[in-house]
């Protein structure tokens, strides 16, 4: 039950995270005009990964796409790439994790297959989250660097440096959305990996032991110390360790050739 809950929660958290990464990638407010300690202008500038916008005091907003690929800074291209990779990995991870969910039965899929799929999706979510966090952090670093540049060469647009009126940019809402979404995707991925451990059947589990003492055969089930039913002073309490978590299906245990003492 705990495994199912962990897996389900991991899926939901990752789903929210990936939705957030997509939202952040599409948002226009990656950087917004810094209004503190700046000449107060009647226009408000903000920029995204794909276009820059200007909102006039009347509320009129005009956005222009970056219609050049070669003219854009390499850092911006890198951020775009990281976010897209994050989205793609996250989307594939979601698709894989849907089939891996314990609560969903697809044909005669074994638990080992589900465990592998859960692990795969978990890793994908972790990488997806890291990509998003990295992308947002690179952009944030770019903003901080440009913010402290000399006023003569103040950062005034994604297209490069323009010697014009000083317009400084600070962190936009998309950065915070991206950081939170990346974090959620990462957490969801970790939860999926944890759930995978609970789904995986162990090959080398010691499931049962036949113990011979005073002519009585006592079968010990895994699960800690058991009171002996044998007679005589040589009867001992033994703890048999189960190498991994058991699924509810494993009711019957079979001894292996190593289980006899």
């Amino acid at each position: 039950m705990a495994v199912t809950a962990c897996q389900g929660l991991g899926f939901v958290v990752s789903l929210i995270g990936i939705a957030g990464i997509i939202a952040a990638t599409c948002m226009d407010q990656w950087s917004t005009q810094d209004l503190y300690n700046n000449p107060v202008t009647a226009v408000f500038n903000y920029q995204g990964l794909w276009r820059s916008c200007v909102r006039e005091s009347s509320g009129f907003t005009e956005c222009r796409g970056y219609f050049t690929l070669l003219g854009l800074p390499a850092m911006l291209q890198a951020v775009r790439a990281l976010m897209i990779v994050g989205i793609v990995l996250g989307a594939i991870g979601l698709l894989v994790s849907i089939f891996a969910l314990k609560c969903i039965r697809i044909g005669s899929m074994e638990d080992s297959a589900k465990a592998n799929m859960t692990l795969t999706s978990g890793i994908m979510f972790i990488v997806s989250g890291l990509c998003a966090i990295a992308g947002v952090s690179v952009f944030a670093n770019m903003l901080v660097t440009n913010f402290w540049m000399s006023t003569a060469n103040m950062y005034t647009g994604m297209g490069g440096m323009v010697q014009t009126v000083q317009t400084r940019y600070t962190f936009g809402a998309a950065l915070f959305v991206g950081w939170v979404a990346g974090g959620l995707t990462l957490i969801g991925g970790v939860m999926m990996c944890i759930a995978c451990r609970g789904l995986a059947p162990e090959e080398t589990n010691y499931k049962a032991v036949s113990y011979h003492a005073s002519g009585h055969s006592v079968a010990y089930k895994p699960g800690g110390f058991k009171a002996s039913t044998g007679f005589g002073s040589n009867t001992k309490n033994k703890k048999i360790y189960d190498g991994g978590a058991r699924t509810e299906d494993e009711v019957q245990s079979y001894p292996s050739k190593h289980d006899y003492v």
Partner: antibody, heavy 120, light 113 residues
Framework: QVQLVQSGAEVKKPGASVKVSCKTS????????IHWVRQAPGQGLEWMGR????????YYNEKFTGRVTLTADTSTSTVYMELSSLRSEDTAVYYC?????????????WGQGTTVTVSS | DIVMTQSPDSLAVSLGERATINCKSS????????????LTWYQQKPGQPPKLLIY???TRESGVPDRFSGSGSGTDFTLTISSLQAEDVAVYYC?????????FGGGTKLEIK
């Protein structure tokens, strides 16, 4: 059609206050900024401030801060400009104007003007 | 505050001739985000309120005759009347529509020669 109708001429003594009204019609009152601009006799135009009737947000020219107050009454679609501690140099024609949408922060409609004379 | 300097103070032009009014701002009015100049031109006839002619330095307000045109970028701007008509006699003002407080030029009085 859009109209801005201002109140009549005023004669005030130095140190007094004056309140000029600007009644608007023909558009959604709460969606546009209203500016106040004055023009002293034979002089140029001087921006005093603006108000957004939808929220009551105001921006003032620092030159007038503390002396000018802009208010809006949404029930009558009217904006008021009150100027206190009047001096002789406040003698001017006071205009209200509407900031156009998508017109580069420009004022596309103007009231007819209200003459305020400050004299002892 | 941004200082707007207009030249000349007054201008006399013959009917049908070209009239040119200049405006210079103490700081650039170009917004890098949309590459637009936040400079406005107004026309004021005696006893009337100002009338919007041109915004964004070069965009004509609807209803304004096409003989009026605006140009320039950054700090230097020009209003041109290609063929002066009798009804164009007025005072013309340029306005900084970018920085608070909004500021106006001193005005240029246009007359017929």
């Amino acid at each position: 059609q859009v109209q801005l109708v201002q109140s009549g001429a005023e004669v005030k003594k130095p140190g007094a206050s004056v309140k000029v009204s600007c009644k608007t019609s023909g558009y959604i009152f709460t969606n546009y900024w209203i500016h106040w601009v004055r023009q002293a006799p034979g002089q140029g135009l001087e921006w005093m401030g603006r108000i957004y009737p939808g929220t009551g947000n105001t921006y003032y020219n620092e030159k007038f801060t503390g002396r000018v107050t802009l208010t809006a009454d949404t029930s009558t679609s009217t904006v008021y400009m009150e100027l206190s501690s009047l001096r002789s140099e406040d003698t001017a024609v006071y205009y209200c104007s509407r900031e156009g949408y998508g017109k580069g922060n420009s004022m596309d409609y103007w009231g007819q003007g209200t003459t305020v004379t400050v004299s002892s | 505050d941004i200082v707007m300097t207009q030249s000349p103070d007054s201008l006399a032009v013959s009917l049908g001739e070209r009239a040119t009014i200049n405006c210079k701002s103490s700081q650039s009015l170009l917004n890098a985000g949309n590459q637009k100049n936040y400079l406005t031109w107004y026309q004021q006839k005696p006893g009337q309120p100002p009338k919007l002619l041109i915004y964004w330095a070069s965009t004509r307000e609807s209803g304004v005759p096409d003989r009026f045109s605006g140009s320039g970028s950054g700090t230097d701007f020009t209003l041109t009347i290609s063929s002066l008509q009798a009804e164009d006699v007025a005072v013309y003002y340029c306005q900084n529509a970018y920085y608070y407080p909004y500021t106006f030029g001193g005005g240029t009085k246009l007359e017929i020669k």
